[in-house]
């Protein structure tokens, strides 16, 4: 028998469903009786879900797991993990036993977007140029951590003076807040741009100085 | 009929290496998953490893883990055991048995293997 | 790592009577659980597998009765040959493949 999975990760987002695909090659006059299925944490080897016995035992993961019953015996042990979580990130493992045995490892990988970037100035008023100004960039309940990225209104990157802090909140999603200082000029404008890597998601936000009053 | 026989055992000290062979016939080798038990003098039995039809995955027992090596040629209908760093616990016979819906239905006569200085 | 614990560790019975052996998971194994005989000097040889079924050739005095994590091998009338050290193996969640301690059922 010969396990197959997806050898790139499984990207899913966040609260939404996720198949992790296994198969195997049934052999001639192969019935589920014969089939012992086993999903577990590769790393742990927590189970997961398991079918043996010519039944499906169940979840044995927050009881959001299901199997494909009705395609099993066609060599489908796929498996759908519903409302994905933060913590459901890593390496699972497909394992099959029959006459023969196999297993293989998939990897899910777990994201959510970023929210369009907020954007606050300090101090917010009586600019001048040649003021010292502290610009925030905040975009919240993003996973995994961001990229942040700020250029100034000619597309220059600003690296120098730039404090980017990420903190997960309680359901492993991050809230990021990245703090350009720089010195005005007669005006500008500064954008910042806060990247998801594994979604290759791009959210934007910019504050243009013109004097008085402030564009965002 | 199904025939599993074993070789290469011996007497090695500590620290040295040995590798068992088992040969099979009488079935179709690359369809059935292969595996070592062995049995120290007077004791019970010890699930050692395993390897899958096709050669691609393995398990071992955590008494052997890093040290043994099981292997298969299906062109040979041979199964191997490479057994390095061999210790006194190492001690006991050998067998070889087939794998079949996770029981063991075929085994083979043993070889033993002594590791003493 | 499932444990599967074998009792009596010896059992003294009389050729023509019945015997009755015990295997105990740590877990459950469902039905998934083999037995084993081996006689001295001899490899084991499969007796049951599935909790109750026999393998080929096994003679119907010995039937297999269980499931989940208590089960029982029974030898309903000893012969000469039958006296010997059974095993019991779990299948059900591996590696590792586990054995029990086995039984050794001697000659009264």
């Known amino acids: 028998v010969e396990v197959q999975v997806s050898e790139d990760p499984v990207v899913a987002l966040v609260d939404t469903d996720a198949t992790l695909r296994c198969s195997f090659s049934p052999e001639p006059g192969f019935s589920l009786a014969q089939l012992n299925l086993i999903w577990q944490l590769t790393d742990t080897k927590q189970l997961v879900h398991s079918f043996t016995e010519g039944r499906d035992q169940g979840s044995a993961y927050s009881n959001r797991t299901a199997l494909f019953p009705d395609l099993l015996v066609q060599g489908n042990a796929s498996l759908r993990l519903q409302r994905v979580r933060v913590t459901d990130e890593g390496s699972y493992t497909c394992f099959v036993s029959i006459q023969d045995f196999d297993s293989a490892a998939v990897s899910l990988q777990v994201a959510a977007p970023y929210s369009k970037p907020s954007m606050t100035l300090e101090p917010n008023k009586d600019l001048r140029p040649g003021n010292m100004v502290t610009i925030t960039c905040s975009s919240y309940q993003g996973y995994p951590e961001a990229e942040v990225f700020w250029k100034d209104g000619q597309g220059v990157p600003l690296t120098g003076n730039v404090t980017t802090s990420q903190m997960a909140n309680e359901r492993g999603l991050f809230d990021v807040h990245s703090v350009l200082r720089v010195v005005l000029g007669a005006n500008g404008t500064y954008s910042c741009l806060v990247r998801n890597p594994v979604l290759q998601q791009d959210a934007h936000g910019s504050v243009t100085i013109t004097g008085q009053p402030l564009t965002f | 009929d199904v025939q599993l026989v074993e070789s290469g055992g011996g007497v090695v000290r500590p620290g040295e290496s040995l590798r068992l062979s088992c040969a099979a016939s009488g079935f179709t080798f690359s369809s059935y998953a292969e595996s070592w038990v062995r049995q120290a003098p007077g004791e019970g039995l010890e699930w050692v490893s395993i390897i899958s039809g096709s050669g691609g995955n393995t398990f071992y027992a955590d008494s052997v883990k890093g040290r043994f090596t099981i292997s298969r040629d299906n062109s040979k209908n041979t199964l191997y055991l490479q057994m390095n760093s061999l210790r006194a616990e190492d001690t006991a016979v050998y067998y070889c048995?087939?794998?079949?819906?996770?029981?063991?239905?075929?085994w083979g006569l043993g070889t033993l293997v002594t590791v003493s200085s | 790592e499932i444990v599967l614990t074998q009792s009596p560790g010896t059992l003294s019975v009389s050729p023509g009577e019945g015997a009755t052996l015990s295997c105990r998971a740590s877990q459950t194994v469902g039905s998934k659980l083999a037995w084993y005989q081996q006689k001295p000097g001899q490899p084991p040889s499969l007796l049951i597998y599935d909790a109750s079924t026999r393998a080929t050739g096994i003679p119907d005095r010995f039937s297999g009765s269980g499931s989940g994590t208590d089960f029982t091998l029974t030898i309903s009338s000893l012969q000469s040959e039958d006296f010997a050290v059974y095993y019991c193996?779990?299948?059900?969640?591996?590696?590792?493949?586990?054995f029990g301690g086995g039984t050794k059922v001697e000659i009264k």
């Open positions: 193996q779990q299948y059900r969640n591996w590696p590792p493949l586990t």
């Open positions: 048995a087939r794998f079949a819906y996770g029981f063991f239905d075929y």
